[in-house]
Interface confidence: low
């Protein structure tokens, strides 16, 4: 339904707390480098006009579209060009070519400090001191810094990190209380960014299509007893919520999930039994709470697949129908028989049934060439099976640091051209599958494996497209959205790869690295590893082994010392020439 | 209202060290965080380092880990920078700011106070 003024329609269905919310992550989305007092002063402007629109839907500018609206007042900018060189151009397009302008500039990598956390006395001041200003800082440094972070789950973010300040800042022991909070926070609020920058990939690099296919495999494994009309409808609107936030829409998209959380709970009865206590709860948590619900009780005795889809004669007169809807009736009916997939695995089925249709209903006899079409399947299915087998059996025997260390080097043997912040950063971040997935039973290990690994690997897909080194990582990042993790996992070692010179400036320690916590060491040593590989590629893992066992007696030894600079200096020395003499550098 | 007064620049060959100083009057030091940003010619001002109330948290931006040591003397009101190992990268206007309220200490906007700056130049 058509409003006279759009801006007056969003501030009125969001309230003006939500409204100025979305509206500043909106706008640090965007210039992700601009001080955060000119954001609040622009979002206070818009909120003003809005509030003017809200009062007469015929004032002047009120029916200008939002894109128009925050693209004016973007522009407005004074330092634009200089702080963002070229994306000052956008500014000369007319919407949508414009929007799309500011799309484009978004940077996954974008060149900010580390946030650093204060002491805890600190924080609460200024949290009491303004409690308003405290949350929007908040808002603002997470936006910018993840420029496609799913902007209504950020409010539901921000609101939890105001309860924890609330509840702490009260405590008698206010660290011991909020610090464990922070931490939850800052982890999930990582997590949540990739898995939101994955679909966004998704629809942007792959098209509606793509996405719509991933999410009706998730919705029919989180709601197999649903019909398939059911799926459909909730695909439909699920994919027009992710495409508005992706696309930085974020007043569409926060009002339209809010409408779709409401629709869900008012017909729970035919979607899922598991959705009582989320549709109990407040907007933002029932919606976050919907997205994370468990998976329902498959409907007892589903019949065979093979009738429909293999046995009947008519299957290639449906197929010929409505292709998307009988390959989309297929995933539907995979899907929630199989909960033990990953949503990846299942797509590759729905892909190879697709193929084998597409071959086999323009043959002579169409149903002998499709009748063992399910047997394809079996090595697809064999495929992570195996591999989650074996990478399991590794973790348990390593544990999750020596884990990554085995990807780091196995990644970076397969794409050493990738830079090493990188290699470091998403090899971590695969090693994290062990502790979060292998502590499963078969049953739910490849659905948590496999969807995981694809969320990370789309973080390296991401980096790596901002500054292109590799064209192995192109080609598997951009030829099959659902083949990316098998198809870096047949990666061998690159043949073509000319060693980096050695430079020691590379492997030189300061005390430094004594008073840094246990995770910023790792990285540090993880970092050092991966230079080794690229320096000595066709390095033995006893070789690398013996090199980090070295390295790791070092730190210690030299963070005991009286004189740690001065041990640093001189025994690093050594530790560079023993190590060199031990790689034949 | 913090007067916050830097000094100690200068010009110093590569490799060769500098000790900043900030002065701080007109309200209570140890009741501020204290930060060192520097900006080159033509560059954005930068994080360099903080360090809170009581010097129970110092941080430091990479570039400079393992060169450069804040330290604070609430006694004296007096914040310093001890820049070692310099660098011509290190060439820059460096300025003392002052927080009293932080959420984040890399971020320049939580400062509220700002000194002069004093002119550091490493070349050879």
């Known amino acids: 339904d058509a409003h006279k003024s759009e801006v007056a329609h969003r501030f009125k269905d969001l309230g003006e707390e939500n409204f100025k919310a979305l509206v500043l992550i909106a706008f640090a989305q965007y210039l992700q480098q601009c001080p955060f007092e000119d954001h609040v002063k622009l979002v206070n402007e818009v909120t003003e006009f809005a509030k003017t629109c809200v009062a007469d839907e015929s004032a002047e500018n009120c029916d200008k579209s939002l894109h128009t609206l925050f693209g004016d007042k973007l522009c407005t900018v004074a330092t634009l060009r200089e702080t963002y060189g070229e994306m000052a151009d956008c500014c000369a397009k007319q919407e949508p070519e414009r929007n799309e302008c500011f799309l484009q500039h978004k940077d996954d990598n974008p060149n900010l400090p580390r946030l650093v956390r204060p002491e805890v006395d600190v924080m609460c001041t200024a949290f009491h001191d303004n409690e308003e200003t405290f949350l929007k800082k908040y808002l603002y440094e997470i936006a910018r810094r993840h420029p496609y972070f799913y902007a209504p789950e950020l409010l539901f973010f921000a609101k939890r990190y105001k309860a924890a300040f609330t509840e702490c800042c009260q405590a008698a022991d206010k660290a011991a209380c909020l610090l464990p909070k922070l931490d939850e926070l800052r982890d999930e609020g990582k997590a949540s960014s990739a898995k939101q920058r994955l679909k966004c990939a998704s629809l942007q690099k792959f098209g509606e299509r793509a996405f719509k296919a991933w999410a009706v495999a998730r919705l029919s494994q989180r709601f197999p007893k649903a019909e398939f009309a059911e799926v459909s409808k909730l695909v439909t609107d699920l994919t027009k919520v992710h495409t508005e936030c992706c696309h930085g829409d974020l007043l569409e998209c926060a009002d339209d999930r809010a409408d779709l959380a409401k629709y869900i709970c008012e017909n729970q009865d035919s979607i899922s039994s598991k959705l009582k206590e989320c549709c109990e709860k407040p907007l933002l948590e029932k919606s976050h709470c919907i997205a994370e619900v468990e998976n329902d009780e498959m409907p007892a005795d589903l019949p065979s697949l093979a009738a429909d889809f293999v046995e009947s004669k008519d299957v290639c007169k449906n197929y010929a129908e409505a292709k998307d809807v009988f390959l989309g009736m297929f995933l539907y009916e995979y899907a929630r028989r199989h909960p033990d997939y990953s949503v990846v695995l299942l797509l590759r089925l729905a892909k190879t049934y697709e193929t084998t249709l597409e071959k086999c209903c323009a043959a002579a006899d169409p149903h002998e060439c499709y009748a063992k079409v399910f047997d394809e399947f079996k090595p697809l299915v064999e495929e992570p099976q195996n591999l989650i087998k074996q990478n399991c059996e590794l973790f348990e025997q390593l544990g999750e640091y020596k884990f990554q260390n085995a990807l780091l080097v196995r990644y970076t043997k397969k794409v050493p051209q990738v830079s090493t912040p990188t290699l470091v950063e998403v090899s971590r971040n695969l090693g994290k599958v062990g502790s979060k997935c292998c502590k499963h039973p078969e049953a739910k290990r490849m659905p948590c494996a496999e969807d995981y690994l694809s969320v990370v690997l789309n973080q390296l897909c991401v980096l790596h497209e901002k500054t292109p080194v590799s064209d192995r990582v192109t080609k598997c990042c951009t030829e099959s959205l659902v083949n990316r993790r098998p198809c870096f996992s047949a990666l061998e070692v690159d043949e073509t790869y000319v060693p980096k010179e050695f430079n020691a400036e590379t492997f030189t320690f300061h005390a430094d690295i004594c008073t840094l916590s246990e995770k910023e060491r790792q990285i540090k040593k993880q970092t050092a590893l991966v230079e080794l590989v690229k320096h000595k590629p066709k390095a033995t893992k006893e070789q690398l082994k013996a090199v980090m066992d070295d390295f790791a007696a070092f730190v210690e030894k030299c963070c005991k010392a009286d004189d740690k600079e001065t041990c640093f200096a001189e025994e690093g020395k050594k530790l560079v020439a023993a190590s060199q003499a031990a790689l034949g550098l | 209202e913090v007067q916050l007064v830097e000094s100690g620049g200068g010009v110093v060959q590569p490799g060769g060290s500098l000790r900043l100083s900030c002065a701080a009057s007109g309200g209570t030091f140890s009741t501020y965080v204290m930060g060192w940003f520097r900006q080159a010619p033509g560059k954005e001002r930068e994080f360099v380092s903080a360090?809170?109330?009581?010097?129970?948290?110092?941080y430091y931006a990479d570039s400079v880990k393992g060169r450069f040591t804040i330290s604070r003397d609430n006694s004296k009101n007096t914040v310093y920078l001890q820049l070692n190992s310099l660098r011509p990268e290190d060439t820059a206007l460096y300025y003392c700011?002052?927080?009293?309220?932080?959420?984040?200490?890399?971020?320049?906007?939580?400062?509220?106070?700002w000194g002069q700056g004093t002119l550091v130049t490493v070349s050879s």
């Open positions: 360090i809170s109330q009581n010097s129970i948290h110092t």
């Open positions: 700011a002052a927080s009293r309220f932080t959420s984040w200490y890399t971020a320049d906007y939580e400062y509220d106070y």
